[in-house]
Amino acid sequence: MAVTACQGLGFVVSLIGIAGIIAATCMDQWSTQDLYNNPVTAVFNYQGLWRSCVRESSGFTECRGYFTLLGLPAMLQAVRALMIVGIVLGAIGLLVSIFALKCIRIGSMEDSAKANMTLTSGIMFIVSGLCAIAGVSVFANMLVTNFWMSTANMYTGMGGMVQTVQTRYTFGAALFVGWVAGGLTLIGGVMMCIACRGLAPEETNYKAVSYHASGHSVAYKPGGFKASTGFGSNTKNKKIYDGGARTEDEVQSYPSKHDYV
């Protein structure tokens, strides 16, 4: 029961986290104009990963997409890549975890397969969360660097002839959404990995029973049959060894005798 709850909660937390990562990636307010001491501005600038926007005091908002790829800063491209990788991994993780949920029965899928899938999705969520946190942190670092650079420029004018208002940018709402969402996805992934341990079937100790046939003394141990069907005591050890390395297809297929060499 606790395992099911942990797995279910991990799934829900990851789902919320990934939704947050998607929202953050799509949001325009990654960086917003620093308003200094003035909360009311006639022209308010803010920027996202995909476009920059200007909101005027008239209420009119104009957004322009970044229609160039090569002209964009490498850091912005890196942040985009990290966020997209995070979303893709998270989406695949969600898909895998749906089938891995203990409360959902799909055909005659065994607990070992579900445990494998739970671990896979858990690792995917962890990596997804880390990608989002890394992406947001890289962008935040870029903002801090640019903020202090533009602050320095504000006080070193062009000979003092003409004052130029330097637009400084600070953290936008998307950064906080991204950090929280990445954290949630990470926590959800950890919960899935914890649930995986509980899902893996416990080793069953069978006592060897001796049957005395006339003229022969043969001992039959049930382990032999189990090894070929994947339910034997070896399964647990196998899980720890290569569970995380399996592909989605391998996890969903039934183990054959070739799986256990």
Partner: antibody
């Protein structure tokens, strides 16, 4: 079509108060008060976000003038206190439009501060 | 606050003349976010409310004749009337629309020669 009609102007003694009104019909996100002293140029007084009520003022009017709006009546106000002779002017309400220009203006209301 | 300086303060011209009014701001009105200059031009006739002519330094307000044009960037701006018409004799104002407080130039009065 946006229509702006000012009212409330008149003669007031120095140190006195007056409240100007601007009846607004049509869509307005934000509004301004602009004044023009006789024979002089235009002077911006204040701005307000008609949705949030967030105001901002020119330095000369901070503390003396208050811009506000009444959602239910769709009316813009300018409360003027501690009036001085130099506040004598025609007061216009104007809608902020694209590029922060002011595209619709009222007919103006004359405020005369004199003893 | 941004100061706006218009020149000339008045000018005399004839119908059909090309008229140029300049406006200088103490700070750049160019917004880096959209690369637009937040300068506005108005026309005012005696006893009337001002009329918006141009916003974003060069964008003509709907209904304004095409003989009016605006140009400039940063701190220097120009309003040009390509062929002056009788109804164009009025006072013209430039306005900083980039930052609060909004400020107006002192005005340029265009009179009949």
């Amino acid at each position: 079509e946006v229509q702006l009609v000012e009212s409330g102007g008149g003669l007031v003694q120095p140190g006195g108060s007056l409240r100007l009104s601007c009846a607004v019909s049509g869509y307005t996100f934000s509004m301004n008060w602009v004044r023009q002293a006789p024979g002089k140029g235009l002077e911006w007084v204040a701005w307000i976000n008609m949705y949030t009520g967030e105001p901002t003022y020119a330095d000369d009017f901070k503390g003396r003038f208050t811009i506000s709006r009444d959602d239910s009546k769709n009316t813009l106000y300018l409360q003027m206190n501690s009036l001085r002779a130099e506040d004598t002017a025609v007061y216009y309400c104007a809608r902020t439009s694209r590029g922060n220009g002011m595209d619709y203006w009222g007919q103006g209301t004359l405020v005369t501060v004199s003893s | 606050d941004i100061q706006m300086t218009q020149s000339p303060s008045s000018l005399s011209a004839s119908v059909g003349d090309r008229v140029t009014i300049t406006c200088k701001s103490s700070q750049s009105l160019l917004n880096s976010g959209n690369q637009k200059s937040y300068l506005t031009w108005y026309q005012q006739k005696p006893g009337k409310a001002p009329k918006l002519l141009i916003y974003w330094a060069s964008t003509l307000e709907s209904g304004v004749p095409s003989r009016f044009s605006g140009s400039g960037s940063g701190t220097d701006y120009t309003l040009t009337i390509s062929s002056l018409q009788p109804e164009d004799f009025a006072t013209y104002y430039c306005q900083n629309a980039y930052s609060f407080p909004f400020t107006f130039g002192q005005g340029t009065k265009v009179e009949i020669k």
